[in-house]
Amino acid sequence: YDFTNCDFQKIEADYLRTISKDLITYMSGTKSTDFNNTVSCSNRPHCLTEIQSLTFNPTPRCASLAKEMFARKTKATLALWCPGYSETQINATQAMKKARKSKVTTNKCLEQVSQLLGLWRRFIRTLLKKQ
C-alpha cells in the first residue's frame, strides 16, 4: 500500500491521543534503554510502511501483535485516514491472523514494540519538520 495520500495530521492526533498510551502500556516494566532501535524511517509514508509491517506482519519470533489493542487501533486509524487502505490491507492481515500458530516469545515482542515506538516517534518528528 502507498501511504502517500494519508491524512498525516489526523494519524498523528490519533497516535498521540490513544495508540501511544496502548504501546506504552504494553511496554510497562521495561526501560527505554533495554532495547536498541534498529529500524528507522526517512519520511512519513516510509514510517507508516514500516509501522504497518512491524505491527501486522507476524515474524517467527513474535507472531501475535496484530491481536493487541494498539494494533487494532492502528488498523482503525489507517482505515480512516488512508483512502484505499482497507481494501488493500484488511483482508490480508485477517488472513495472516488465521494462519498464525507459533507461540509468542514475550521478550522478542517487547523488542518489536520498542521498535514501533521509535518508528512512531520518527513519524511525529518528520511531521513537525514539514510544518
Partner: antibody, heavy 120, light 111 residues
Framework: QVQLVQSGAEVKKPGSSVKVSCKAS????????ISWVRQAPGQGLEWLGV????????IYAEKFQGRVTITADTSTSTAYMELSSLRSEDTAVYYC?????????????WGQGTLVTVSS | QSALTQPPSASGSPGQSVTISCTGT?????????VSWYQQHPGKAPKLMIY???KRPSGVPDRFSGSKSGNTASLTVSGLQAEDEADYYC???????????FGGGTKLTVL
C-alpha cells in the same frame, strides 16, 4: 441478536436541542463505526456524522458542523446524537447505522429510526 | 442539494431488468471504489444491497448487481419482482473530511 435499538419519538420546540440514543447488542460495539443518517418526510437520506469508539474519532458533515455532537459510551454499547438550535427543517426520522469494521462508510445494520418533530 | 445525482424514478415490468444510475465527481465516485446501494421500503429502515461498487452482502439476491464507470455508478436489478418496488439510494465515500454522500434516491416501480 445483532441489532441497534433507538430511543423513542421526540417533540421539540425551535431553538432547543434533542439527544437520541442508539443501543447496540450482539457485536463488539467499539470496533465498528456508528453513523447517524436522517430522512425528512418524503425526502432522501442525509448523513450527519460518524463515531469510531475504538479510536474515539468523530467526523461530521460540513452542513451540521457545530450543531451536531456524536458521542459513545462503550461501557453500555450506546451511541448518542445531539442536535442543537433546532428548526422546523430538522423534523425527520433519525437513524443510527453501523459502519462495517474498518470499512466505516458501508452501513450494514440500521436502527429502527427515531422521529424528531420540531414544532412551536 | 444532493452531492450524487440519481433519476427520481425508474420502472420495469416483472421479469425485466432495470438500471439506476448515480452520478458524482472525481472527488467521490470517480476517486474511490467505495460506492454502496441501499433499498428502502416505505416506513422501513434502509437495507444495504451493494458495497464496494459490486459486492453483495449475504442474503441479497444475485439479481442485484453494481458497477462503475468513471464518475457514474449503476445498480441493475434483473428479473424484476414485485417486492423490488422501493426507493434506492446510492452512497459514496468522499474523502477523509467529507466522508459520505448519499444520492437523492430513485423510486423503482414494478409495473
Amino acid at each position: 441478536q445483532v441489532q441497534l435499538v433507538q430511543s423513542g419519538a421526540e417533540v421539540k420546540k425551535p431553538g432547543s436541542s434533542v439527544k437520541v440514543s442508539c443501543k447496540a447488542s450482539g457485536f463488539t460495539f467499539g470496533s465498528y463505526g456508528i453513523s447517524w443518517v436522517r430522512q425528512a418526510p418524503g425526502q432522501g437520506l442525509e448523513w450527519l456524522g460518524v463515531i469510531v469508539p475504538l479510536v474515539d474519532v468523530t467526523i461530521y458533515a460540513e452542513k451540521f458542523q457545530g450543531r451536531v455532537t456524536i458521542t459513545a459510551d462503550t461501557s453500555t454499547s450506546t451511541a448518542y446524537m445531539e442536535l442543537s438550535s433546532l428548526r422546523s427543517e430538522d423534523t425527520a426520522v433519525y437513524y443510527c447505522a453501523r459502519g462495517q469494521e474498518y470499512f466505516y462508510w458501508y452501513f450494514d445494520l440500521w436502527g429502527q429510526g427515531t422521529l424528531v418533530t420540531v414544532s412551536s | 442539494q444532493s452531492a450524487l445525482t440519481q433519476p427520481p424514478s425508474a420502472s420495469g415490468s416483472p421479469g425485466q431488468s432495470v438500471t439506476i444510475s448515480c452520478t458524482g465527481t472525481i472527488s467521490d465516485i470517480g476517486g474511490y471504489n467505495r460506492v454502496s446501494w441501499y433499498q428502502q421500503h416505505p416506513g422501513k429502515a434502509p437495507k444495504l444491497m451493494i458495497y464496494e461498487v459490486s459486492k453483495r452482502p449475504s442474503g441479497v439476491p444475485d439479481r442485484f448487481s453494481g458497477s462503475k464507470s468513471g464518475n457514474t455508478a449503476s445498480l441493475t436489478v434483473s428479473g424484476l419482482q414485485a417486492e423490488d418496488e422501493a426507493d434506492y439510494y446510492c452512497s459514496s465515500y468522499a474523502g477523509t473530511d467529507t466522508f459520505v454522500f448519499f444520492g437523492g434516491g430513485t423510486k423503482l416501480t414494478v409495473l
